[in-house]
Amino acid sequence: RQQWELQGDRRCQSQLERANLRPCEQHLMQKIQRDEDSYGRDPYSPSQDPYSPSPYDRRGAGSSQHQERCCNELNEFENNQRCMCEALQQIMENQSDRLQGRQQEQQFKRELRNLPQQCGLRAPQRCDLEVESGGRDRY
């Protein structure tokens, strides 16, 4: 069993190294920014909206293209729930330093958890996406 788990870990590791998770990161960041642009998630901002809508984000075409490419990448992890979780954790880790607000971080996590389902894939049952609040600057 240990040998099998070790092989599984190695297989997952090489899958993660091969995968291009950038389209997933681009899709998620566009999605949460589009939601914020639409609804103004900062209730304390004078105009109820910290930012004004951007035509680039409103178009949505770029985001659906990213989503399609993202789903293709996540499909590689369909048969390994633990590895799917590690892929989601990697996405969270890669973007955490871009999210300098509690709501932004929570919304990103919510969207990230829903991602496998959006792609028609099984979502991992237990997957801890916690990172240090505000993220660390990674260059």
């Epitope: 914020e36 930012y51 951007s54 990213h66 607000g101 509690r102 609040s133």
Partner: antibody, heavy 118, light 111 residues
């Protein structure tokens, strides 16, 4: 109404210390990264330090690393900047600013003047 | 450390005329998520700075549409389509890819 009010500025000799405060009201202070930025006539705007909403992560400009310490008191909605070993080149107006959540500086205080002079 | 270089450092303008400021970065400001982490701020005389443009091209709330930002990677531009008297002040670009740093500022004044 959004308000960030800095205090604690003044005239101080080189090598001495000063502690700046920034009292926040009308904004979700505890939900966002907070920053200190300074403006001097010769250097313009210079980002100084930032602290994540949970206070776990702290970031500093190279020019102040090891001398300045940023902290926050969530119960009092207050941001602090402890400035030690002050130098003449630290003379500036110091502003506190709240992050937008996406690394932009969205809300700014009116600033407090720090003068380091012998 | 990322260095931002603005030009020109001083810009005399005529009300009603267009104006543009350039900001060049010592390295690309595109994050792996596809966004350019470059903002523009204006500090009017006697006031605190204010956010104009974030992520290179998105206009902040309440900012007049005569202001626009463009560019990607290392070269960015802030354009004012028709300058108004109230637009005078010092304009700064700021990168937020690696911690945060400002350009040296461009002073815009009426001719």
């Amino acid at each position: 109404q959004v308000q960030l009010v800095e205090s604690g500025g003044g005239v101080v000799q080189p090598g001495r210390s000063l502690r700046l405060s920034c009292a926040a009201s009308g904004i979700a202070f505890n939900d966002y990264t907070m920053h200190w930025v300074r403006r001097s006539p010769d250097k313009g705007l210079e980002w100084v330090a930032a602290i994540s909403y949970g206070g776990t992560n702290k970031y500093y400009a190279d020019s102040v690393k090891g001398r300045f310490t940023i902290s926050r008191d969530s119960s009092k909605n207050t941001l602090f900047l402890q400035m030690d070993s002050l130098r003449v080149e630290d003379t500036a107006v110091y502003y506190c600013a709240r992050d937008s959540g996406y690394r932009s500086l969205l809300h700014w205080g009116q600033g407090t003047l720090v003068t380091v002079s012998s | 450390e990322i260095v931002l270089t603005q030009s020109p450092l001083s810009l005399p303008v005529t009300p009603g005329e267009p104006a543009s400021i350039s900001c060049r970065s010592s390295q690309s400001l595109v994050h792996r998520n596809g966004y350019n982490y470059l903002d523009w701020y204006l500090q009017k005389p006697g006031q605190s700075p204010q956010l104009l443009i974030y992520m290179a091209s998105k206009r902040a709330s309440g900012v007049p549409d005569r202001f626009s930002g463009s560019g990607s990677g290392t070269d960015f531009t802030l354009k004012i389509s028709r300058v108004e008297a109230e637009d005078v002040g010092v304009y700064y670009c700021m990168q937020a890819l690696q911690t945060w740093t400002f350009g040296q500022g461009t002073k815009v004044e009426i001719k």
